[in-house]
Interface confidence: low
């Protein structure tokens, strides 16, 4: 969690002298409570923004608007503490908007926004604001909070933010995977324009179970330059295992912006659907051979073989 | 000009603790994978932990599992390694190094020395 | 977890010599596999990555090969400024082992 570095933050308007101050999210009137306090935020809505860094990076924001409630309690309004909480890290940050003048109503309801939160794809966030000075112990709570949940790296606009083009978001390698028989698979995929290895993971499992009956991992050497952005192909073999069926494979990428952590993709193929009689599997009859050039590759392990071949 | 620059070495008992800090310039740190490699006197290089470069993946040699924590401050551009219940085997120069795109550390700091003596 | 060997532990040669290391791993590694160069007193220096190719910057006397589980680095004619510890290291999964070392020094 940290704040848009891209310029002074500001929280002043019209009739309201404002400066928005780092928090530690204990604000002081926890500590020296104050018997009048202002009542809670109205109408808090959390929206995705996108916005740019001074070196031009776009990244997600988190866009927090309340107005203020029409009630005389905005004499004793001080100022408000935004907080954003990331839910699977229990990391939080503050911000406190200090007011520097005294509210007074006038014709339009007061309304407050707020769009420095930079926030990361598909997790999510608890944004509370907290009006001040804070209630006593005991007293009427007097701040609101949502839960905001940011779309992953598929999502249209995030896919071009920086933080999902370091992860490899612009790369879509169109998997298709084809049963050639009972004992070999075909992947097809199309190369990113990066001269980097990847690895096709397959994961194997009986028909409507979760536990896998069989797992092989594939490397793919590094493409050359005029191999990007062709189909590249995999012919995989699978371990001859009744009712191990249901084939899931997994590209991961290791592209320089992301190495170990880069997305990945996968495909599914489901098991088949059974004849009423049972039709005889006829011997293999392989429906695509290795060109001159491409390499067979036999898993350590020995858990599953496979070949694969880079179209131009 | 890439650079990593460790600090937080000294001199440490047994059972004591020690935070290692990386701080990385000269290439955009958010995007890279880190590791800590040690290397005890007159001894050869040994891994110590890994992590990814939105802190997603971690992981740590078997020697030093439970003991230390690996973490990054992508906005301080920095790398850290918090070293808990010290041992005497502990006592090396540690590096941080940044992996290369196909495998490797291309990037190494200069070292950091640590040493774990009563 | 994989275990790397390196052999020999030391070696001398003369200069113009060729020089082979050789590292082995317990299990196949494919080419995730790194060699590294460390003079006394300094930080180590990648040389190798995916098993054959050179880092950029590093004189072409310097090759690796190999696949697998047998690895091996060649200095095609040593030279003085050669004189360092030599380092494997596997990276397909951590734990991200190195070998032992080999050290050369000149006769």
């Known amino acids: 969690l940290r704040l848009l570095d891209h310029r002074a933050l500001v929280c002043s308007q019209p009739g309201l002298n404002c400066t928005v101050k780092n928090s530690t999210c204990l604000d002081d009137s926890w500590i020296h409570p104050r018997n009048l306090t202002p009542s809670s935020p109205k109408d808090l809505q959390i929206q995705l923004h996108f916005a740019h860094t001074q070196q031009g990076d776009l990244f997600p924001v988190a866009h927090i608007e309340w107005t203020l409630q029409t009630d005389a309690s905005i004499l004793y309004l001080e100022g408000a503490e935004l907080s954003v909480l990331q839910l699977n890290t229990n990391e939080r940050l503050c911000v406190r908007f200090e007011f520097l003048s005294k509210l007074r109503h006038h014709h339009r309801r007061w309304r407050f926004t707020f769009s420095h939160f930079v926030v990361d794809p598909d997790q999510e966030y608890e944004v509370t604001v907290h009006h001040l000075p804070k209630p006593i112990p005991d007293g009427d709570p007097n701040h609101q909070s949502k839960n905001f949940l940011v779309p992953d790296c598929e999502h249209a606009r995030m896919k071009v933010t920086t933080p999902c083009m370091s992860s490899g978001s612009l790369w879509d390698p169109n998997i298709t995977v084809e049963t050639l028989d009972t004992q070999h698979l075909r992947v097809d995929f199309t190369l990113w324009n990066e001269s980097t290895h990847y690895q096709i993971l397959l994961t194997s499992f009986p028909h409507m179970e979760n536990h896998s009956c069989f797992e092989h991992m594939h490397h793919i050497p590094a493409p050359r330059p005029e191999e990007f952005h062709q189909r590249s192909n995999v012919t995989l073999t699978l371990r001859n295992l009744k009712g191990c069926c249901r084939h899931q494979v997994q590209i991961q990428p290791f592209f320089s912006s992301c190495l170990n952590d880069c997305l990945r993709h996968s495909a599914t193929v489901s098991c088949p659907e059974m004849p009423d009689t049972p039709e005889p599997i006829p011997d293999y009859m392989p429906l695509w051979e290795p060109r001159s050039g491409s390499s067979d590759y036999k898993d350590d392990d020995d858990k599953g073989s496979s070949h694969h071949h880079h179209h131009h | 000009e890439v650079q990593l620059v460790e600090s937080g070495g000294g001199l440490v008992q047994p059972g004591g603790s020690l935070r290692l800090s990386c701080a990385a310039s000269?290439?955009?740190?958010?995007?890279?994978?880190m590791n800590w490699v040690r290397q005890a006197p007159g001894k050869g290089l040994e891994w110590v932990s890994f992590?990814?470069?939105?802190?997603?993946?971690?992981y740590y040699a078997d020697s030093v599992k439970g003991r230390f924590t690996i973490s990054r401050d992508n906005a301080k551009n920095s790398l850290y390694l918090q070293m808990n219940s010290l041992r005497d085997e502990d006592t090396a120069v540690y590096y941080c190094?940044?992996?290369?795109?196909?495998?490797?550390?291309?990037?190494w700091g200069q070292g950091t020395t640590v040493t774990v003596s009563s | 977890d994989i275990q790397m060997t390196q052999s020999p532990s030391s070696l001398s040669a003369s200069v113009g010599d060729r020089v082979t290391i050789t590292c082995r791993a317990s299990?196949?590694?494919?080419?995730?596999l790194a060699w590294y160069q460390q003079k006394p007193g300094k930080f180590p220096e990648l040389l190798i990555y995916?098993?054959?190719t050179l880092q950029s910057g590093v004189p072409s006397r310097f090759s690796g090969s190999g696949s697998g589980t047998d690895f091996t680095l060649t200095i095609s004619s040593l030279q003085p400024e050669d004189v360092a510890t030599y380092y494997c290291?596997?990276?397909?999964?951590?734990?991200?082992?190195f070998g032992p070392g080999t050290k050369v020094d000149i006769k």
């Open positions: 290291q596997k990276y397909n999964r951590a734990p991200f082992t």
């Open positions: 995916a098993a054959s």
């Open positions: 190094a940044r992996p290369k795109v196909g495998g490797g550390m291309d990037v």
């Open positions: 992590i990814s470069a939105r802190s997603s993946t971690i």
């Open positions: 000269g290439f955009t740190f958010s995007s890279y994978s």
């Open positions: 299990q196949g590694i494919s080419n995730y």
